[in-house]
Structures are given as C-alpha cells and as structure tokens.
C-alpha cells in the first residue's frame, strides 16, 4: 500500500523555540515515521533537518539548527516506513516574520504600598531577538486578588513600580512584551501574585518637586514627622529601558545626603543635559521609610521652563488674555518645543479669593468680572507630560481695570 | 565561568596594615558592585561594604568606617580591601562578593582570605 | 541599623524531614532578603533573593517565604548535603546586615 504524505504541516516559532507540528494522513498505519528536509532560499539542495528525521510522533523540535532567522527557509515532509511516501512541501517563511514573543520573566518586589516587578525576556541571550533587545516593551494587567478589577499599564519597560496601593494585599499580574518596531505582541507571562507587606512605620516623602533658583536646583517635598533625615538619589532615566535584570545603580546627590530640611540645593553642574529620575528617603536614625515615588527630571525643561509672558485686553464682563511665549535675558522669546497648558489665577485686588483657570489654549477669557472693578492676573505653565510633571514659577501679577457696563461687544 | 578568585592567607602584626585582592572573571567588575564580608568563628557574618567599580563610590557598614578602605581596578578587572590599624578583633575570614542585578543580594562569592593578627 | 534576628542558633533534623529556619527583621524591608547556606571551611552559597526566588540550580525542596518583617526558609525533604548553617541577610537598606545563623544537624 502506498503510504500518503503528511498535511497540514504547521511551523510554530516562539522565541528560539521552533516547533513543528502536522497530521497523519492516514491513522490506520502504524509504525510510520516522519522526516524533514530543509532548503534555504537560492539553494537547489534540500538538507535533512536535524532533529526532525525517524520521528514517531507529530511534533519536532528544530531549535539546534542554527538559521539565518531574516532568511527564508522551505521546508518538505514525508512519511516512512518499508517504502516512503511522496514529499509535501511547505510554504516557504522567514522565521523573524513568523515568529511570536515568548513570555517574559517577572519577578516581583513588594512594599507596603508598592509592588517593583523586574521584567526580562523570557529567553536569553535570545538569537531572535539579537537585533532588538533594547526594543521591547512591557505591558501589564494587574489585579487586587479579592476584587479581580483589572487594571492595564502599557508602555512600561524592564523595571517598573505601581505606586498606591493597600498594605497586606495581595495582587495578581500578567506581562507581556511588544516590539512595536515589528507589529509584534507576545503571550502573557503566566499569573504571578504578591502580598505587599504590613504598612511601614515611616511613610515616604512626596510632592518632590525641582525648580531652578540662580545657578542651583532646589529639590522640594512634604513629610509628616519632624526631626527626619533625609537623602537624594538620581539615575539616568535611559537605564530603565535596559533588558533583563540590570543593576541600577542609583547615585547620592552629594549635598542631599543626610539633610535635615525637606528641600536640598545643589548646583546645577551636578547634572549633565538630560532626563534623570530622582528619589528621596526619610529616617529618624532607628527605622528608614521605603523610597519615595521617582519623579522623572530633565535638566532641559527645568532650566528653560519660563512663566509665561501675556496681554490683557480689559472689556466690562470680562478678560481676554493673550498668552506669549517667555523672554529670555536679551528681550528674545523662548521657543519650547513641548505642549504646554497653562493656569491662570485671577482675583478682585480688594479681596483675597482666588479664582483659577486652565487651559491648553494661549488665547483665555476669564469671564463673569464685575465692570470697573480692578481685577490682578497671574499665570503659569505646565508641561502636559504627566511623568516630567514639571511647572513654571508664576509670572508676576498683572491689575488692571474692567471697563463700564455695556462694551463688552 | 564567573569566578572570584581572593588573594592567599596573610599573617600581620598589631597596628600594620594588610591590602586584600578580589580578582574577577567571567563578568567585567564595572557592571557590578563588589562586596566584602568578614567572617569569625561564632560570630557569623559581617558586612564590610561595597564599592561601586565604576566610579569608586562607596557604601561602608559604621563599624568599619575608617577600619576599611574599598577600591577597585577595572582594567584589571580586580577589587580590594585595605585594612588598618589591625588587632586582634581583625582576625577573620573576609569574603568578596558581587552584585550584579537589582534583584540579587550577592550571588558568586570568592573562596575567602585568611587574615590572622598576632605579634 | 537592622537587626536580623535568627532566634534558633540550631536546629536537629532527620533525613527526609521537613524543617523550616525563620529570620525577623527589626524594621520592614520588603521583600529584600536572601539566605545563604556556608558548610564549614567553604564560602556561603546563595539559596534565595528577594524572599521567595530560588537561584538558579538549588534544589526545589529549598523555599524561601515572608515579606516585611517576617521571613522562613523551608527545607523539605531534608538531605544529609544539607547539614550546614543558614544566614539571612537584608538588603533593603544600607548598611545590609545579616543574621546571626542557623546551624542544620542532622540526626
């Protein structure tokens, strides 16, 4: 009896991982054994494909060939036993097209009111991905185990902490990596759950903002008890993006190490150009709190993040306030090439009730202003990034008069 | 192979100085923290501190703050310990160590040098 | 500085049994802790990071647990290559400090 060519041949590939998988075509035999050849593109000879020759079964694995993964590659079957059947080829494929991302490895720190995960590519030193190790991303789903409310954080890259969160919980997550350079999306990691643990004595210091007086930073944040020590560390922001698991190593701010106030100033030399993420941590000399959240800091947006310049156009009702770029020392205006949005408080000279306004345009009315009433305007700006969380000083206060009834047409 | 391979067995007098080496394969010391760690019979572990090989910052437990001194080499790929002003309480096993990822503590350890201090 | 309390200086155990050494921190540090194994005359060896995670080629009967304060290694299964002294170490802050040990006998 003549034996029939295996069908339906299917290539898997994840990761450095290539599978191969098919059907019988004719189950009623038995003893039968499959082999592969393979042929690379240009070539006119087929190769027998090591690791799939004599298998018994309907799987092989070929990940020991060591394969050009740009180069297409055909691939040919056929079943064997006292006589051998005809060879079913396959379609031809390039193994990077073809294949998928492989789960990454996650392994999670926990806090009271965080949780770090460390992500890395499932495979190392991945033949596959040779080419664009420092292109993956990560996203994550994360869950409260009690409530199963799932949460997505996309874009996040090999170190990641998630912030806020309920002391002694547990909360599940999954991972997945991309590589949006190739419209690739991986598989989730499989479910890795943590407890966060028992809330700390200390909490950590917030609000931590930088802001820029004369030729020095002044790094600002809150805290709840006095008598602490605190310090300051920095690392460049690029090295979260490293894969797999890195060392990060975090730096003291020299004149932020051991300070008893909760600001800092250092000059500004002790950052070159560029985005840094900065760390405070508080101590009473017996117990340390954990790290604060990392704010994200870049040297270009702090130095040159000016308070806005605007004009007021007075009617009786009302503002129009024309908003201009800043000017720097020599009267020329400042071009930032990053959207802003701007907050703009306004208030009756006589009184001290603030009123406040944002608004991305650079063109605000302030409306619902009594006529001939001398109204004081200032106003400040803000980067829209939510991560560089970065703000101007406000501008000094500009009064002026609104007009009598009726010329607000 | 990553290996850790310490300096031999020394033998000082009281009030000299001795300077331990920690010479790395397998791994390029700048990519890491190197540790070190003193051990004495029945009194467990200590550590010493670390230093940084990149750039020579260094981290020192109190207790040995001005006892040890912690530099490094990189293009010899090698760590060390400089101790001074050596007594008795000196006499211990000391240990180098690395750290290589922010997830690890310290994961290859060298195979320990023998410091005894006795006039 | 943190104090890593290991309360049991020893520990007699049987071949086969399951035995668990427990390490208290003085203050909270997360997850940030490892345990070490150190036969007489050898250098440690590392078991476990961050609390839970086995280092590449120790046996699975080795399982690190605890978050906070609060921290055990459970041996299972205990074999006569286990008999050694168990440290835990914090590496949450500096200076990083370590346990007192634990001494594994075997019966």
């Known amino acids: 009896k003549n034996l029939k060519s295996p069908q339906k041949v299917e290539v898997d590939i994840i990761d450095d991982n290539f599978i191969l998988r098919w059907n019988r075509s004719d189950e009623s035999v038995g003893n039968v054994t499959f082999s592969f050849d393979y042929q690379k593109t240009g070539m006119d000879n087929w190769i027998k494909l090591s690791g799939c020759q004599n298998i018994t079964s309907t799987k092989c694995n070929f990940s020991s060939l060591k394969l050009n993964v740009y180069e297409e590659i055909k691939l040919r079957i056929r079943a064997e036993k006292e006589n051998t059947s005809s060879w079913y080829e396959v379609d031809s494929f390039t193994p990077f097209r073809k294949a998928q991302i492989g789960p990454p490895e996650v392994h999670l720190e926990a806090e009271d009111k965080a949780i770090v995960i460390h992500i890395s590519p499932g495979t190392k030193d991945s033949v596959m991905w040779a080419l664009d190790g420092l292109s993956f991303t990560y996203s994550l789903v994360i869950w409260k185990n009690s409530s199963g409310v799932e949460e997505r954080i996309e874009n996040i890259y090999s170190r990641h902490k998630i912030y806020k969160l309920s002391p002694e919980t547990t909360y599940c997550l999954k991972v997945k990596a991309a590589l949006l350079t190739s419209w690739k999306i991986g598989v989730y990691s499989p479910v890795h759950c943590i407890k966060t643990t028992v809330e700390n004595e200390l909490p950590p210091p917030e609000n931590i903002e930088v802001s820029v007086q004369n030729q020095n930073y002044v790094l600002k944040w809150d805290y709840t008890y006095a008598n602490m020590t605190f310090q300051v560390q920095w690392l460049h922001a690029f090295l979260k993006r490293n894969p797999g698991n890195h060392l990060y190593k975090w730096k003291q701010i020299p004149d932020c190490e051991n300070v008893k106030t909760t600001q800092c100033v250092f000059p500004q030399n002790v950052f070159q150009k560029g985005i840094y993420l900065l760390r405070v941590q508080a101590s009473d000399g017996n117990n340390t709190s954990f790290w604060s959240e990392e704010i994200k800091f870049d040297t270009e947006i702090q130095a040159f993040l000016l308070p806005p310049v605007f004009n007021i156009r007075s009617l009786s009702d009302s503002f129009h306030i024309y908003i201009g770029a800043p000017k720097q020392s020599g009267n020329t205006p400042v071009i930032q090439d990053y959207p802003l949005i701007y907050e703009i408080i306004f208030w009756e000279n006589t009184s001290n009730a603030e009123r406040k306004i944002i608004e991305k345009k650079t063109d605000v009315t302030v409306p619902n202003l009594k006529p001939l009433t001398v109204y004081c305007v200032k106003a400040r700006a803000h980067t829209m990034d939510e991560k560089l969380n970065k703000s101007s000083v406000f501008s000094d206060a500009v009064c002026e008069k609104t007009k009598p009834g009726n010329t607000s047409k | 192979e990553v290996q850790l391979q310490q300096s031999g067995a020394e033998l000082v007098k009281p009030g000299a100085s001795v300077k331990l080496s920690c010479t790395a394969s397998g791994f390029n010391i700048k990519d890491s923290y190197m540790h070190w760690v003193k051990e004495r019979t029945e009194q467990g572990l200590e550590w010493i501190g670390r230093i940084d090989p990149e750039d020579g910052e260094t981290n020192y437990a109190p207790k040995f703050q001005g006892k040890a001194t912690l530099t490094a080499d990189t293009s010899s790929n090698t760590a060390y310990l400089q101790l001074s002003g050596l007594t008795s309480e000196d006499t211990a096993v000391y240990y180098c160590?690395?750290?290589?990822?922010?997830?690890?503590?310290?994961?290859?350890w060298g195979q320990g040098t023998s410091v005894t201090v006795s006039s | 500085d943190i104090v890593m309390t290991q309360s049991q200086k020893s520990m007699s155990t049987s071949v086969g049994d399951r035995v668990s050494v427990t390490c208290k921190a003085s203050?909270?540090?997360?997850?940030?802790v490892a345990w070490y194994q150190q036969k007489p005359g050898q250098s440690p060896k590392p078991l476990i990071y961050?609390?839970?995670y086995r280092y590449s080629g120790v046996p699975d009967r080795f399982t690190g647990s605890g978050s906070g304060t609060d921290f055990t290694l459970t041996i299972s299964n205990v074999q006569s290559e286990d008999l050694a002294e168990y440290f835990c170490q914090q590496y949450n802050n500096y200076p990083w400090t370590f346990g007192g040990g634990t001494k594994l006998e075997i019966k």
């Open positions: 961050l609390a839970s």
């Open positions: 203050q909270n540090v997360g997850t940030n």
């Open positions: 160590a690395r750290r290589v990822s922010s997830l690890y503590a310290m994961d290859y």
